[in-house]
Amino acid sequence: DAHKSEVAHRFKDLGEENFKALVLIAFAQYLQQCPFEDHVKLVNEVTEFAKTCVADESAENCDKSLHTLFGDKLCTVATLRETYGEMADCCAKQEPERNECFLQHKDDNPNLPRLVRPEVDVMCTAFHDNEETFLKKYLYEIARRHPYFYAPELLFFAKRYKAAFTECCQAADKAACLLPKLDELRDEGKASSAKQRLKCASLQKFGERAFKAWAVARLSQRFPKAEFAEVSKLVTDLTKVHTECCHGDLLECADDRADLAKYICENQDSISSKLKECCEKPLLEKSHCIAEVENDEMPADLPSLAADFVESKDVCKNYAEAKDVFLGMFLYEYARRHPDYSVVLLLRLAKTYETTLEKCCAAADPHECYAKVFDEFKPLVEEPQNLIKQNCELFEQLGEYKFQNALLVRYTKKVPQVSTPTLVEVSRNLGKVGSKCCKHPEAKRMPCAEDYLSVVLNQLCVLHEKTPVSDRVTKCCTESLVNRRPCFSALEVDETYVPKEFNAETFTFHADICTLSEKERQIKKQTALVELVKHKPKATKEQLKAVMDDFAAFVEKCCKADDKETCFAEEGKKLVAASQAALGL
């Protein structure tokens, strides 16, 4: 349905508050280095313009596309060339090339200062003094650091952020009330950002078909009672929503997401029995709730898959008539029966099935050729099952910190060229799979673990893409989206790696480590561990453990000393010497 003025249409659909918030997010995700005040000014100008279009859709420029309007506005920024360099060249292009150019310059790891949380009283004062600016600043700071954050979901986070301050700034113990809530929002926000980053990577690097396959599998697991036609409709709509958000079309994305939530709730009887509570909530909570809703129970008496996909004489006929529809039905039928499988495993099975049909439907006796196709699934299913079993046993034996360290060593040996901060960040996140998933019963472990690992490995892929240093990482990241995890799992020690030169400065520590939080202290130690492995890739587990134990004892000793700095200087030299001797450096 065409509208005379797209900007007026979206302003009316979304309302002024959401419109302004979404434009701010869009601008902050594109121009990640611009000061807050500059963005607010641009947003206000766009909002005033939108209001004129609401009043008169035929007014000048109101018929322009949102990309044209927003791009023109971004290109008015005076310091574009100085701040962003070649990104300024985007402004010489016409739409849609200009928007594509802006998208290509989004930076997953922008050079921005770490967000430091002020004292609670300072935050509460700022909140009370100017609530609107305080919340806008939250949107701005998150959006610029997470340029692919799912915008309508960020509105939901902002709503919870506001609620936390509204409640806790009146509490007797403000800090006790507020800090856990902020920690929870931070952790959930990081997870949400990483999950959305995978969706965008899937769309942008592997195309709409890959995303749709993922969506068919996930929605079929979640809504196993919904019919294939219903799931297909939801997949089409969901793909549109995510394509828009990943493409920077945040107003359209938020509007379409609201429409999709409305449709799901109006048709919940045909979709899932688990949606009732979600559908009673206000819009932002409703959409979030639907996205996180638990899997519905499987319909009773689902027949054998073999009947339609192996035993039927019409398999090749049905496949030839509409390949993607038939494969989609296979994926739907398999996924709804297997909430215990990861989405990526289901996609591997579908790929195997597709490959088999491609080969067999051209053979002399197709049925004889594909009769045993389900037997080929067995090793594909057992591989992640065994891997998860082994790693959960290791996690239960070591605990999270030491499990992370084991992964740090494992991954540094696989891809030692990757930067130390990236290896630390990714391995720490990989290690969190233990506490996140190993507590689950068997039936929930694989979807939890392998789909989470897909999200974390995508972080490695997008960070590595910015500055490629390892052919092995590039290969695992680009060859197959669903085989990324098995590809990384299969990597052995990189024998071609030339060990890093020893630099004593890397292993020099100061008294400031004593005032760090437990988490930050762990990161310092884990950074040292990665550097050790880069210097001595052939070091054994036992050698590394001994050095790390000595290092932990050294930090503990010096943090208890009266003259901490002297202790770190003197004992540090001894530790470096002892470590060099122990590792044969």
């Epitope: 689902l302 027949p303 054998s304």
Partner: antibody
Framework: ELQLVESGGGLVQPGGSLRLSCAAS????????MHWVRQAPGKGLEWVSA????????YYAESMKGRFTISRDNAKNTLYLQMNSLKSEDTAVYYC??????????WGQGTQVTVSS | DIVMTQSPSSLSVSLGDRVTITCQAS??????LAWYQQKPGQTPKLLIY???RLQTGVPSRFSGSGSGTSFTLTISGVEAEDVATYYC?????????FGQGTKVELK
């Protein structure tokens, strides 16, 4: 061709027990559901119980929970229904069936269970 | 439990008549409905599954329609061999439930 053959029916006193068997042949996979359905004399069909062949999950009609137990032996390709504390209203023909709601649907010929003193 | 209410409970028909049997579910069962035919002294035979899909080997005069809570089995031109009792079955959730049956006989 898949075949289902029930056995184990007969005459039993109220409060007694009976174990029905259903021998299956011709299976090509194990991702399906097997059912017991009964039909009292001159009455309609009544679903009794079901079991998923692959993972052994079981389901029962409310009135039979606690008294009836469905099980299967994969190695023997046999379905069972252990019936305890039998009542006269359990008198019926008991059918075993595979996938009662799909094209891959098969029924046995049924076995008569009579509960009478 | 989901209750399936079939109507009518019986009907007398002439050869060639168009027959309609309805089945009402006490809650939305989407399209998880099957229709069975049972002739005296025989095992039940599946006619329709998925509310409207004709089982292989079943004559095309049988058809099923409906979704949600209201379903229909139609025999477009009754033949003598169609004398039987017809049952609907919901298989959305356990416990599975049958309708009470509709007995079709010739006038």
């Amino acid at each position: 061709e898949l075949q289902l053959v029930e056995s184990g029916g007969g005459l039993v006193q109220p409060g007694g027990s009976l174990r029905l068997s259903c021998a299956a042949s011709g299976f090509t996979s194990d991702d399906f559901v097997m059912h017991w359905v009964r039909q009292a004399p001159g009455k309609g069909l009544e679903w009794v119980s079901a079991i998923r062949w692959d993972d052994g999950s079981t389901y029962y009609a409310e009135s039979m929970k606690g008294r009836f137990t469905i099980s299967r032996d994969n190695a023997k390709n046999t379905l069972y229904l252990q019936m305890n504390s039998l009542k006269s209203e359990d008198t019926a023909v008991y059918y075993c069936a595979k996938s009662v709601s799909a094209s891959s649907n098969y029924w046995g010929q049924g076995t008569q269970v009579t509960v009478s003193s | 439990d989901i209750v399936m209410t079939q109507s009518p409970s019986s009907l007398s028909v002439s050869l060639g008549d168009r027959v309609t049997i309805t089945c009402q579910a006490s809650q939305n069962i989407i399209s998880y409905l099957a229709w069975y035919q049972q002739k005296p002294g025989q095992t039940p035979k599946l006619l329709i599954y998925g509310a409207s899909r004709l089982q292989t080997g079943v004559p095309s005069r049988f058809s099923g329609s409906g979704s949600g809570t209201s379903f229909t089995l139609t025999i477009s031109g009754v033949e003598a061999e169609d004398v039987a009792t017809y049952y609907c079955l919901q298989h959305l959730t356990y416990p599975l439930t049958f309708g009470q049956g509709t007995k079709v006989e010739l006038k």
